[in-house]
């Protein structure tokens, strides 16, 4: 058909009546309706409903709606349904993105790694390494790394300093009362059950779509740490698969503090004498990396001379 | 009132071509589609094409391409039709018509040696 | 393309009588149908376009109607001037093609 017309107060579209030979000038139907008659020298345009299945988005002068998209294919879920006005739109569930027009699972970052980039319904989650004062001790999707406990600020200090994987560990000097200092020679270490130590194999290998270049490749800040060990070593907190602790290490007179923050458990200890803690990082192989482009679902786009 | 006046009739040799006329009167000429129709003997009628001259839009048949060849002159409120390599399938009568409704007198086109 | 046929090809009756013709479609085509009317040695006359409205100046013993692929042309009381070539022309698709054409005789 001949070319549109603008108009400023109501669109108009150009028909030509076939029968006639002529170019008339006809008001466009609204949204969610076609001109089921066209306007004629004598008459206006007759605009129709949409029937069930089809739409129209803007003002038209086309003669038939267009059709819905298709159902929505699994695991797609429907975002805008198929009415009048409006198709229907399929998208991804929480927690998937879309990939090769279907939905997959968002990258979980793992453990040492945190969410740099939240996932959307058509992009993947990006980690990144924790960076210096920050780790991230549970494989996610959602979390970013978090900071280090700041012992200081609670006047306590660093028994074992944080990793990648770990929070510092805090602790304090209790008072001298031998009434409530346990034996020499023992420390209790009682373990929050929900923290369980990820055994990852130590190894080089960057995960998919997780920027090294982003990562800290030196060691973590040590916060300041109480000098002149006494007697005794830091329990090695990573050694075990379940969290099962030796608890008869030479460290004297320890106590710990649970803190819960969050969902999140951090311990802290109460130390009696001081002494200097060392701390490793471990690196983390990934649990998956995040796929690569973002291909859209067809959006089913009409173009009609006569629709805006 | 509305009227088409075409031009008198064409006597041509095949493989020479011919310009038929229609002159509009009684309406604005380019508010208006323009078409020709060819009605042969034996053959029925048969749509050619139509012109827009308000903006010089051109619709053919596939069967008319290359053989039909249509123009308008604002100026003098006249369509054109030029068949071109005439053979005697081309001798028929040719009418110009507003829409489909309105219909100029027609022009006997005779192809012959 | 769209074919039409029209029925009957031609018809005798009398003055005074009432006649349908009729055209059908290959496909549908809404209401976009024409009748025309050619009397011997001339041109063509429009009778009736989008299925039933009459053109100016034409007789009201004219009417058309029917819709989607089937269609018809009745003349009620037929006078001596209505005997002629009729012929129906679908415009709701290039190329536009007509009916074979029905011939109208005094009997």
């Known amino acids: 058909q001949p070319e549109q017309k603008a108009s400023n107060l109501i669109g108009t579209y150009r028909h030509v009546d076939r029968a006639t030979g002529q170019v008339l000038t006809c008001d466009k139907c609204p949204a969610g309706t076609y001109v089921s008659e066209h306007c004629t020298n004598t008459s206006l345009r007759v605009c129709s409903s949409c029937p069930v299945g089809t739409f129209t988005r803007h003002e038209n002068g086309i003669e038939k709606c267009h059709d819905c998209s298709q159902p929505c294919p699994w695991p797609m879920i429907e975002k805008l349904p198929c009415a009048a006005l409006t198709d229907r739109e399929c998208t991804c569930p929480p927690g998937m993105f879309q990939s090769n027009a279907t939905c997959a699972p968002h990258t979980v970052c793992p453990v040492g790694w945190g969410v740099r980039k939240k996932g959307t319904e058509t992009e993947d989650v990006r980690c990144k390494q924790c960076a210096r004062g920050t780790f991230s001790d549970v494989p996610s999707s959602v979390m970013k790394c978090k900071a280090y406990t700041d012992c200081l600020s609670q006047n306590l200090v660093v028994i074992k300093p944080g990793t990648k994987e770990t929070d510092n560990v805090c602790g304090t000097l209790p008072s001298f009362s031998s009434s409530t200092s346990p034996s020499p020679g023992t420390a209790i270490f009682p373990r929050p059950e929900h923290m369980e130590t990820h055994e990852v194999p130590s190894s080089t290998y960057v995960p998919k779509g997780m920027n090294s270049t982003e990562s800290n490749s030196s060691a973590s800040v040590r916060p300041k740490v109480l000098s002149s060990i006494q007697e005794g070593t830091v329990p090695d907190n990573t050694s075990s698969a379940r969290g099962k602790e030796d608890v008869n290490k030479t460290l004297p007179n320890l106590q710990v503090v649970n803190h819960q923050q969050g969902p999140h458990h951090r311990h802290i200890l109460k130390l009696l004498p001081s002494m200097e803690a060392t701390g490793g990082e471990k690196s983390s192989t990934p649990i998956k990396g995040p796929k690569r482009g973002h291909p859209r679902q067809n959006l089913h786009k009409h173009f009609d001379i006569n629709e805006h | 009132q509305v009227q088409l006046q075409q031009s008198g009739t064409e006597l041509a040799r095949p493989g020479a071509s011919v310009k038929l006329s229609c002159k509009a009167s009684?309406?604005?000429?380019?508010?208006?589609?323009l078409n020709w129709m060819k009605q042969g003997t034996g053959q029925g009628l048969e749509w050619i094409g139509e012109?827009?001259?308000?903006?010089?839009?051109?619709y053919y048949n596939e069967k008319f391409k290359g053989k039909a060849t249509l123009t308008a002159d604002k100026s003098s409120n006249t369509a054109f039709m030029q068949l071109s390599s005439l053979t005697s399938e081309d001798s028929a009568v040719y009418f110009c018509?507003?829409?489909?409704?309105?219909w100029g007198q027609g022009t006997l086109v005779t192809v012959s040696l | 393309d769209i074919l039409m046929t029209q029925s009957p090809p031609s018809m005798s009756v009398s003055l005074g009588d009432t006649v349908s013709i009729t055209c059908h479609a290959s496909?549908?085509?809404?209401?976009?149908i024409g009748w025309l009317q050619q009397k011997p040695g001339k041109s063509f006359k429009g009778l009736i376009y989008?299925?039933?409205t009459l053109e100016d100046g034409v007789p009201s013993r004219f009417s058309g109607s029917g819709s989607g692929a089937e269609f018809s042309l009745t003349i009620s009381s037929l006078e001596s001037e209505d005997f002629a070539d009729y012929y129906c022309?679908?415009?709701?698709?290039?190329?536009?093609?007509f009916g074979g054409g029905t011939k109208l005789e005094i009997k």
């Open positions: 022309v679908q415009y709701a698709q290039f190329p536009y093609t």
């Open positions: 496909q549908g085509i809404s209401s976009n």
């Open positions: 009684g309406y604005t000429f380019t508010d208006y589609y």
């Open positions: 989008h299925g039933s």
């Open positions: 018509t507003r829409g489909v409704i309105k």
């Open positions: 012109i827009y001259p308000g903006g010089d839009h051109t």
